[in-house]
Interface confidence: medium
């Protein structure tokens, strides 16, 4: 589903983030404490170019609980 070269844009990006982040919610722009100064947000990282599941997960609102 998140193969190399795949881009996610618009509503499809939102839909995917909902699935990946589940009940945690997500941000389009990472909160400043976690932000990479060079990165504007997930649209630049996953729509303007391809991204992977690990990158998508960095936009979830709270860290995944470890088992």
């Amino acid at each position: 589903a998140y193969g190399p070269g795949e881009t996610l844009c618009g509503g499809e990006l939102v839909d995917t983030l909902q699935f990946v982040c589940s009940d945690r919610g997500f941000y389009f722009s990472r909160p400043s404490s976690r932000a990479n100064r060079r990165s504007r947000g997930i649209v630049e990282e996953c729509c303007f170019r391809s991204c992977d599941l690990a990158l998508l997960e960095t936009y979830c609102a709270t860290p995944a609980k470890s088992e």
């Epitope: 618009g10 990006l13 939102v14 983030l17 009940d23 919610g25 997500f26 729509c47 609102a61």
Partner: antibody, heavy 120, light 112 residues
Framework: QVQLVQSGAEVKKPGASVKVSCKAS????????INWVRQATGQGLEWMGW????????GYAQKFQGRVTMTRNTSISTAYMELSSLRSEDTAVYYC?????????????WGQGTTVTVSS | QSVLTQPPSVSAAPGQKVTISCSGS????????VSWYQQLPGTAPKLLIY???KRPSGIPDRFSGSKSGTSATLGITGLQTGDEADYYC????????????FGGGTKLTVLG
């Protein structure tokens, strides 16, 4: 010029369904999501959902899930919004609006609106 | 009850400046991008501001947008009678049930 032209006014009975069309022209239909927004008389704007005309994928506001279906016919650059199990509270003006995939550009072109009246 | 809170109405005289506030939370305004729409009586909404503070071509620089934390503001300077309309803020809410959300709308009255 870039425009979205919607179908005409509809009068429906409670329990029925309505299907509103939105024909795009002046741009590449598959390059923009289509959103649907409604507005009851004297009330604010209420977002219903989005559709990607390229893939046909959709996302609906929780309030409308199970009652709304958004589809498209790319050969005629037209998007459709069907709302079922109509009730009087669904009486409103329904708008389609295009939305660049780069979501923060806003909904930059809107249809003229379609008035749907639900009355017994 | 809207997720984004706007004052129901504001008013000012022609030539004056007015601001319209839009208050939200971390799941919408703070971490997402805000748009503003103008809706003249009997017409469809029109995009005024996108990405917090950018104007589409054709929108005069009398209109401006800003964002700080969980609030956004629309500013209009040099008020004209033609500015009398309803104004709506909008963004994505990316909490559990993600979707676009609008403010309740603000009616701008240009006095006189």
């Amino acid at each position: 010029q870039v425009q979205l032209v919607q179908s005409g006014a509809e009068v429906k009975k409670p329990g029925a369904s309505v299907k509103v069309s939105c024909k795009a022209s002046g741009y590449t239909f598959t390059s923009y999501d289509i959103n649907w927004v409604r507005q009851a008389t004297g009330q604010g704007l209420e977002w219903m959902g989005w559709m990607n005309p390229n893939s046909g994928n959709t996302g609906y506001a929780q309030k409308f899930q199970g009652r709304v279906t958004m589809t498209r016919n790319t050969s005629i650059s037209t998007a459709y919004m069907e709302l079922s199990s109509l009730r009087s509270e669904d009486t409103a003006v329904y708008y389609c609006a295009r939305d660049p995939y780069y979501y923060y550009y806003g909904m930059d072109v809107w249809g003229q609106g379609t008035t749907v009246t639900v009355s017994s | 009850q809207s997720v984004l809170t706007q004052p129901p109405s504001v008013s000012a005289a022609p030539g004056q400046k007015v601001t319209i506030s839009c208050s939200g939370s971390s799941s919408n305004i703070e971490n997402n991008h805000v748009s503003w729409y103008q809706q003249l009586p009997g017409t469809a909404p029109k995009l005024l501001i996108y990405d917090n503070n950018k104007r589409p071509s054709g929108i005069p620089d009398r209109f401006s947008g800003s964002k700080s934390g969980t609030s956004a503001t629309l500013g209009i300077t040099g008020l004209q009678t033609g500015d009398e309309a309803d104004y709506y803020c909008e963004t994505w809410d990316t909490s559990l049930s993600a979707g676009r959300v609008f403010g309740g709308g603000t009616k701008l009255t240009v006095l006189g």
